[in-house]
């Protein structure tokens, strides 16, 4: 048989987050190299990563078309080396992946407080609204502009004095809380899915803000802005 | 000895379409990977697209997917380059070629066909 | 994508001089496992599709005079053609196959002084 020498694919594993996505597999290769395949359940195959000697390969062009869709990719394994000396006429062999659907199984990527602002006894926490991949006209979209109200933030907030948390939800970028006069607060935030009933329904914690530090001093009577 | 001939060349007008055919003989043509490589007068070689032995897999330079395609029917030992939507940048000369001793080396190349595409 | 860059655009060499045509990668070519460079050197005759002169950087293909050598590793590449001959006048193109799109150098002039 030509195809003696190369071995399938297998764990192939999608990998996604923010849209960003790529399917990983083994074996590493000896004698071999790979050409990946990824279709829509309708759609024709389309090759990517061609004959490549890497064990992952970056999908995100093609599934950023329609975050919606669910695809599947296939992973052939090809001799190293003009297939002549391998004698090889026949089909390489192949595995398929598992369906992928990115808009419900794509990871949610650490969110970050972009600012807080003090009022008095209000504070304002914004969420950095992170771009994606995801095209519409030539311009890149947000989380935000393609999950739309699908995605809401969650708040952590505690007073730096104690470890008592409370939290506060939005589906916009914006929190508006009250706060004890006087008091310093930390803040993190959790994006959240609810409407996924899997392990990626929730991103991790974003880092932890806090009123007071050195990047800027919160005021009662003024505003304070943090940015990274 | 290998040989590699191409047909299907032309002058056509900005949009329209044309195949080109790559006849391929001395070698046995299913067990090798193609290409089709182009030359606008007076300039480089820019590689066009790849089809696998098998025929299954194929890859194309950004200039022309979606607009070409390539494919090969190892029954006839021949490789064919449709080319639809065709722009004035088309204009070269078309080479087939195979691969040799790895993928993308090309041992033989054919004498090419040119394609004008003028209105 | 990987960028090939060739120097000179152009060169004038007398007969039985030597000629040397340097090509840069974008990126290294090189693949660590085998630790192989992904690069071959054509020769373009005028009315002629190239020929395959040298591949892995330095290997010979059958058939080719041993005035053409090929060196260098990672992103910096040269042909040397050691005595040049009448024969050699014709233009020479760097390719890198290491991963697709292939990409080739715009390509050098070769020419007798």
């Known amino acids: 048989s030509g195809t003696t020498n190369t071995v399938a694919a297998y764990n192939l594993t999608w990998k996604s987050t923010n849209f960003k996505t790529i399917l990983e597999w083994e074996p590493k290769p000896i004698n071999q190299v790979y050409t990946v395949q990824i279709s829509t359940k309708s759609g024709d195959w389309k090759s990517k990563c061609f004959y490549t000697a890497d064990t992952e390969c970056d999908l995100t062009d093609e599934i950023v078309k329609d975050v919606k869709q669910t695809y599947l990719a296939r992973v052939f394994s090809y001799p190293a080396g003009h297939v002549e000396s391998t004698g090889s006429t026949e089909e390489p062999p192949y595995e398929n992946s598992p369906e992928f659907t990115p808009y419900l199984e794509t990871n949610l990527g650490q969110p970050t407080i972009q600012s807080f602002e003090q009022v008095g006894t209000k504070v304002n926490v914004t969420v950095q609204d992170e771009w994606t991949l995801v095209r519409r006209n030539d311009t890149f979209l947000s989380l935000r502009d393609v999950f739309g109200k699908d995605l809401i933030y969650t708040l952590y907030y505690w007073k730096s004095s104690s470890s008592g948390k409370k939290t506060a939800k939005t589906n916009t970028n914006e929190f508006l809380i009250d706060v004890d006069k006087g008091e310093n607060y930390c803040f993190s935030v959790q994006a959240v899915i609810p409407s996924r009933r899997t392990a990626n329904r929730k991103s991790t914690d974003s880092p932890v803000e806090c009123m007071g530090h050195e990047k800027g001093e919160s005021r009662e009577t003024g505003h304070h802005h943090h940015h990274h | 000895q290998v040989q590699l001939v191409e047909s299907g060349g032309g002058v056509v007008q900005p949009g329209r379409s044309l195949r080109l055919s790559c006849a391929a003989s001395?070698?046995?043509?299913?067990?090798?990977?193609m290409h089709w490589v182009r030359q606008a007068p007076g300039k480089g070689l820019e590689w066009v697209a790849v089809?696998?032995?098998?025929?299954?897999?194929?890859y194309y330079a950004d200039s022309v997917e979606g607009r070409f395609t390539i494919s090969r029917d190892n029954s006839k030992n021949t490789l064919y380059l449709q080319m639809n939507s065709l722009r004035a940048e088309d204009t070269a000369v078309y080479y087939c070629?195979?691969?040799?001793?790895?993928?993308?080396?090309?041992?033989?190349w054919g004498q090419g066909t040119l394609v004008t595409v003028s209105s | 994508d990987i960028v090939m860059t060739q120097s000179p655009d152009s060169l004038a060499v007398s007969l039985g001089e030597r000629a040397t045509i340097n090509c840069k990668s974008s990126?290294?070519?090189?693949?660590?496992?085998?630790?192989?460079?992904?690069l071959a050197w054509y020769q373009q005759k005028p009315g002629q599709p190239p020929k395959l002169l040298i591949y892995?950087?330095?290997t010979r293909e059958s058939g080719v005079p041993d005035r053409f050598s090929g060196s260098g590793s990672g992103t910096d590449f040269t042909l040397t053609i050691s005595s040049l001959q009448a024969e050699d006048v014709a233009v020479y193109y760097c390719?890198?196959?290491?991963?697709?799109?292939?990409?080739f150098g715009g390509g050098t002039k070769v020419e007798i002084k």
């Open positions: 070629a195979r691969d040799g001793v790895y993928y993308g080396v090309y041992d033989y």
């Open positions: 001395g070698f046995t043509f299913r067990s090798y990977g």
């Open positions: 990126q290294s070519v090189l693949f660590s496992s085998n630790n192989k460079n992904y």
């Open positions: 089809i696998t032995y098998d025929g299954i897999n194929k």
């Open positions: 892995w950087a330095s």
């Open positions: 390719q890198q196959f290491h991963s697709y799109p292939l990409t």
